[in-house]
């Protein structure tokens, strides 16, 4: 029998489908499951992130039974992907401890409003970043990032929560926006697309790159997640896209090469301590920033996102990686885990150098029609 | 630490029953496929049954089938080979491992010796 | 089912010097869904076998950058650039494209 590309009737997985099927339709994402850069920002459109309060954007919720961390990061919800992907009509043991945000996924049923109210607001992300509408903010000083270099122990966990991998990042990562606005780094995780489709979530002018980094971070005026949800700057995103690039990128490659042992939703494993600024762009000085929302449910808003005006390199085979190892819910590969752009709806995106004359993802005219709201700071 | 010791191996005439168990820790054991694997001594490797996630596909070699019963118990994170009919050509260190979606088997056990002799 | 046949059965390697298995399938691995599934493992003396590669080229987490797997269709190759003590073991090639799932015979690879 040729094998199902299903764990669940091949050895190469696990998931539940026909006996002898080969490659089951559930394996690869339908068109009308993956966001498409065309579509309206409609509700239906709002793909989200990952696992926490839902938003993969958030830190993930660690069991009861596991110590309690300095930001009491276990009592938020542990939001889980719905059901077991190898029995997805037995899914009464799970979600004990989750609530209605873990019942979401990209595409499709249910629409994110009725996961969360927030889904549906008017300030949400992400955005299509237009260099030349930005407004150039001088007061938008380098951002500065301490004990981001983590020596190998103690290790990190990896998972593969069912909508992206998030590394669980350690206390003691301190990043300051700007004087006063002061964060703690909480986890990092992914968001990319499928074979020939890129799947960033910010895009630059319309154009897609074919991954982003996001690293989140909690205000250090709230000691938990729960407290700074939905309040203005209580959370903040560090976003960075990742493109082709001609050599293997050695710090990914830390993380990628173990993606295969996490290849299953809701696995994970442990990762020896790494430099995480090396996952992150060099040139700290040049970047967007906006005040948007988490790109999955719960969406709250308020989250102060900061896009690098660079990218990160990547190997084609390491994006390869990237995009094809890890496996969803349902028996489905986890791939085009991005929400759509959402309307800026009067929002002004502000950028830390004049854009609107290099910009760089993305050239464009040298015009300069907002100004910076952070001027007078 | 991810870990697959294997138990209940021994001694037993032709014709005779052993169950073999295999358990799984360190890892989320209900999400992964699993095989079984002997190798007779001084020979090499030879699959002998595969189980999903969810049970719902099994797979035997033929050299097996109809006397080889493989089952796993995800509440108790324990993997199962019900072994009958033994006969001598079924002599050999018993390995369960895990399968990954690349088709690899990264994990496996130490093994357990099953030795049919009369 | 598909045979799988390793060469040499035994290689004789001085340390430093590389190394090199051939692997054969019966028929084509390729599997309807794109992927090629033939990994490699390494049985060192008295230990369980141990995945080196997967799906042809891709080193399994923690595998030195010495081992390297090529090939494509039925024709497959695992080299190791510069033998070191701790690679003398028996090396096995597997095929999990199709049931029943087959490994290679073997070939052992030892110090000169």
């Known amino acids: 029998q040729r094998l199902p590309r299903m764990q669940e009737d091949s050895p190469l997985g696990g998931g539940s489908s026909g006996e002898d099927d080969p490659l089951g339709e559930e394996d690869l994402p339908s068109e009308e499951d993956s966001p498409r850069e065309e579509d309206p920002p409609g509700e239906e459109d709002l793909p989200g992130e990952e696992d926490l309060p839902g938003e993969e954007d958030l830190p993930e919720v660690k069991p009861k039974s596991e110590e309690e961390g300095s930001l009491k990061l276990e009592d938020l919800p542990t939001v889980e992907a719905p059901g077991d992907p190898q029995e997805p009509q037995n899914n009464a043991h799970r979600d004990k401890e989750g609530d209605d945000q873990s019942h979401w996924r990209y595409g499709g049923d249910p629409p994110w409003p009725r996961v969360s109210p927030a889904c549906a607001g008017r300030f949400q992300s992400p955005v299509d970043i237009r260099p030349q509408l930005a407004a150039f903010c001088p007061a938008l000083r380098p951002l500065e990032l301490l004990g981001f270099q983590l020596p190998p122990l103690p290790e990190l966990r990896l998972r593969n929560n069912g909508h992206s991998v998030q590394l669980t990042l350690p206390p003691g990562l301190e990043m300051a926006l700007g004087p006063g606005r002061e964060y703690r780094a909480l986890q990092l995780h992914l968001h990319w697309g499928a074979a020939g489709r890129p799947g960033s979530e910010h895009t630059v002018e319309g154009h897609r790159f074919p991954a982003e980094i996001h690293v989140v971070h909690l205000s250090t005026a709230f000691a938990r997640v729960d407290e700074a949800l939905g309040r203005p700057g209580g959370l903040a995103v560090l976003a960075a896209f990742l493109e082709e690039g001609p050599e293997e990128n050695s710090a990914y490659e830390q993380l990628l090469s173990r993606l295969e042992e996490i290849a299953e939703e809701g696995s994970e494993t442990q990762v020896p301590g790494l430099d995480i600024s090396a996952l992150l762009p060099s040139d700290f000085s040049r970047y967007f920033q906006y005040e948007g929302s988490l790109t999955t449910p719960p969406c709250a808003q308020g989250v102060i996102w900061t896009v690098f005006n660079q990218t990160v390199m990547l190997s084609a085979k390491q994006l390869h990686t990237l995009s094809d190892t890890l496996w969803g819910p349902g028996d489905s590969r986890l791939q085009l885990n991005f929400r759509a752009t959402q309307p800026l709806n009067g929002r002004v995106i502000e950028a830390s150098f004049p854009a609107g004359v290099d910009s760089s993802p993305r050239a464009a005219e040298p015009v300069q029609l907002n100004s910076c709201l952070a001027a007078g700071d | 630490r991810v870990q697959l010791v294997e138990s209940g191996g021994g001694l037993v005439q032709p014709g005779g029953s052993l169950r073999l168990s295999c358990a799984a820790s360190?890892?989320?054991?209900?999400?992964?496929?699993m095989n079984w694997v002997r190798q007779a001594p001084g020979k090499g490797l030879e699959w002998v049954s595969y189980?999903?996630?969810?049970?719902?596909?099994?797979y035997y070699a033929d050299s097996v089938k109809g006397r080889f019963t493989i089952s796993r118990d995800s509440a108790k994170n324990s993997l199962y080979l019900q072994m009958n009919s033994l006969r001598d050509e079924d002599t050999a260190v018993y390995y369960c491992a895990r399968s990954l979606r690349s088709g690899g088997m990264d994990v496996w056990g130490q093994g357990t010796t099953v030795t049919v002799s009369s | 089912d598909i045979v799988m046949t390793q060469t040499p059965l035994s290689s004789p390697v001085t340390l430093g010097q590389p190394a090199s298995i051939s692997c054969r399938a019966s028929q084509s691995l390729v599997h309807s869904d794109g992927n090629t599934y033939l990994s490699w493992l390494q049985q060192r003396p008295g230990q369980p076998p141990r995945l080196l590669i997967y799906?042809?080229?891709n080193r399994f987490s923690g595998v030195p950058d010495r081992f390297s797997g090529s090939g494509a269709g039925t024709d497959f190759t695992l080299k190791i650039s510069r033998v070191e003590a701790e690679d003398v073991g028996v090396y096995y090639c597997m095929q999990a494209t199709q049931f029943p799932l087959t490994f290679g015979g073997g070939t052992k690879v030892e110090i000169k």
């Open positions: 799906k042809i080229s």
């Open positions: 360190g890892f989320t054991f209900s999400r992964y496929s």
């Open positions: 189980i999903s996630s969810s049970s719902s596909t099994i």
